[in-house]
């Protein structure tokens, strides 16, 4: 355990005034795993003045950080960069004169308690005023700052000229692009203090490069991948006070591909499972032994899960017999192209034949049995992928 602190498997606490700690507590090698620490409590540590960039990074599981009644004066910008689990920060009654929102912008904090710090009235802490104004009343804190006359002023009354939230505006073309093509987005930002502009492209797969010049920025996306369809691209303007963003959704059109087609499985119904990708939504057509398969209430396509441009479903068959054994071909088609895949399905052996011992019994002897059955009908119901009640369950995308 760090000197002058006590530890459990998930907690570190350093609360004794003397001799106290002069640096943020670090676990010794071969002691408790820092990743398991969820809470650090520091109190009465007047000689603890700084949290350095790498002091907290080992505590990746940290949820609660409390440093109260201590001497904290400075927190490095990247101090909490690796602590994405942090939810509660309490820096009550320390010596902080300034604190940037850059410390916390990547965190999903439930609490940030900062009362009793000698903040200097400046644009640097205007973000705290903005934060307070967006909080519901029970959560508000009595925050003060020292003005030029060294008088305590409520943060709620703070007025700093040329110190406001920035703005971002995207000038985007219609972001519906064909796979393999390129597109350029333009963004302009404004505000005082002058904001920085950056692009948030999330997990964009396609190659992209940006150029930024003062208040203007462009993002060029080349050889666009179908994997990026539905992804959001944001232009972000950020300054001391806060940030603004403007976003667009990327839609990529591409030819269908059948990524999965398997032999039938039996559950409540028989199912020939498939997965099809394509945008716009492909039309599906089944073929049985090379001829169009006309769907009916006994044999029909069901889509169970829709994941943006990917469709998981089944050709569902009610009580198929040996009459339905054969080759099934799925064709998926949209305006950009088509794809087809085939599987052989065997549902059951013929009557009077021990199929276990005669698996290759010549089907030609039974041609007279291939007249239409109640499983099919003569109407061609080929159409776009039908939506079903199964696809309407919660947690499904459409």
């Amino acid at each position: 355990c760090p000197t002058s602190c006590k530890c459990s498997s998930a907690r570190i606490w350093c609360t004794e005034p003397s001799p106290g700690i002069v640096a943020f507590p670090r676990l010794e090698p071969n002691s408790v795993d820092p990743e398991n620490i969820t809470e650090i409590l520091i109190a009465n540590q007047k000689r603890l003045e700084i949290i350095n960039e790498d002091d907290v990074e080992a505590y990746v599981g940290l949820r609660n950080l409390t440093i109260v009644d201590s001497g904290l004066k400075f927190v490095a910008y990247k101090a909490f960069l690796k602590n994405s689990n942090l939810r509660h920060i309490n820096f009550t009654r320390n010596k902080l004169t300034s604190l940037s929102r850059r410390h916390f912008r990547h965190l999903d904090l439930s609490d940030l308690i900062l009362t009793g710090n000698p903040f200097t009235c400046s644009c640097d802490i205007m973000w705290l005023k903005t934060l307070q104004e967006t909080k519901s009343s029970p959560d508000t804190q009595d925050l003060y700052c020292l003005n030029e006359s060294s008088k305590n002023m409520p943060l709620a009354n703070l007025q700093i000229p040329n110190c406001g939230l920035p703005s971002a505006r995207l000038a985007a073309p219609n972001l519906t692009v064909e796979e393999g093509k390129s597109v350029t987005l333009s963004c302009s930002v404004g505000g005082d203090p002058l904001p920085t502009l950056y692009w948030d492209v999330g997990n964009l797969v396609s190659k992209h490069m940006n150029e930024t010049s003062h208040t203007q920025g462009s993002l060029r996306i080349t050889n666009i991948s179908s994997d990026d369809s539905g992804k959001q691209i944001s232009c972000v303007a950020e300054n001391l006070v806060g940030e603004d963003q403007d976003s667009v959704n990327l839609t990529v059109h591409f030819a269908p591909t059948i990524t999965f087609l398997e032999s039938p499985t039996s559950d409540h119904h028989w199912c020939i499972p498939f997965t099809v990708r394509g945008n716009p939504k492909p039309a599906l057509q089944w073929f049985y032994n090379g001829a169009i398969l006309n769907e009916s209430k006994y044999i029909c396509t069901k889509i169970h899960v829709t994941n943006h441009t990917e469709y998981h479903g089944c050709l569902q068959l009610d009580n198929p017999t040996h009459m339905n054994n054969g080759d099934y071909t799925l064709m998926a088609k949209n305006e950009y192209g088509k794809d087809e895949r085939q599987i052989s399905a065997h549902f059951m052996g013929r009557p009077g034949v021990d199929y276990e011992t005669n698996p290759n019994y010549p089907e030609v002897l039974y041609e007279d049995w291939t007249t239409p059955t109640d499983i099919g009908d003569t109407t061609n119901k080929s159409n776009e992928i039908p939506s079903t009640d199964v696809a309407d369950q919660s947690n499904r995308e459409h």
Epitope: S4, K6, T15, E16, S18, P19, N44, K46, R47, K95
Partner: antibody, heavy 116, light 106 residues
Framework: QVQLLQSAAEVKKPGESLKISCKGS????????IGWVRQMPGKGLEWVGI????????RYSPSFQGQVTISADTSISTTYLQWSSLKASDTAIYYC?????????WGQGTTVTVSS | QSVLTQPPSLSVSPRQTASITCSGD??????VSWYQQKPGQSPVLVIY???KRPSGIPERFSGSNSGNTATLTISGTQAMDEADYYC?????????FGGGTKLTVL
């Protein structure tokens, strides 16, 4: 070396005020907590409270809250314990304690006698 | 405020081991210091942070703390160790002393 030098013994009447002192030397006075401890005749030790001279942050034990005031003057490296109205039950030896390694340095004690 | 309980007195023969206990609720979660006080003298810190010895304190003084009990052990007790011993811990940033144990070396 680190030393804490306390003011001389005091004899007072009930209702009078009093301020005793403790002067630190040989270490960075402002950077370490200083505590005051009471020992009544024939009894054990009791924490009165502690002060951090650099910012005058003061903590009192519950039984002494509102009864005494602890203060510090960093310019002369001195901390004080004062009463606005003494009682006979305040008769005791009062020690100050500080140091870089816990409270490892103690003053010699100031005997306060309150008697009518 | 928490209460620290010590035995009022303990007698030990020279060169024997003396163990003075100090008990309190979840005391192991706090740091315990031990002070020695001889008649007419100021207290002297002999153990701090459960187990640490300040410079100048003989090795025969040692400390431990877990659960609800802290212990000061004096191995090979000498006549000069006869004194009152006080345990001390911090509770909500104020100090708390035990009632003290009078150690008599027979």
């Amino acid at each position: 070396q680190v030393q804490l030098l306390q003011s001389a013994a005091e004899v007072k009447k009930p209702g009078e005020s009093l301020k005793i002192s403790c002067k630190g030397s040989g270490y960075r006075f402002t950077s370490y907590w200083i505590g005051w401890v009471r020992q009544m005749p024939g009894k054990g030790l009791e924490w009165v409270g502690i002060i951090y001279p650099d910012d005058s942050d003061t903590r009192y034990s519950p039984s002494f809250q509102g009864q005494v005031t602890i203060s510090a003057d960093t310019s002369i490296s001195t901390t004080y314990l004062q009463w606005s109205s003494l009682k006979a039950s305040d008769t005791a030896i009062y020690y100050c304690a500080s140091g870089e390694v816990a409270f490892d340095v103690w003053g010699q004690g100031t005997t306060v006698t309150v008697s009518s | 405020q928490s209460v620290l309980t010590q035995p009022p007195s303990l007698s030990v023969s020279p060169r024997q081991t003396a163990s003075i206990t100090c008990s309190g609720d979840k005391l192991g979660d706090k740091f315990v210091s031990w002070y020695q006080q001889k008649p007419g003298q100021s207290p002297v810190l002999v153990i701090y942070q459960d187990t640490k010895r300040p410079s100048g304190i003989p090795e025969r003084f040692s400390g431990s703390n877990s659960g609800n009990t802290a212990t000061l052990t004096i191995s090979g007790t000498q006549a000069m160790d006869e004194a009152d011993y006080y345990c001390q811990a911090w509770d909500s940033s104020t100090g708390v002393f035990g009632g003290g144990t009078k150690l008599t070396v027979l």
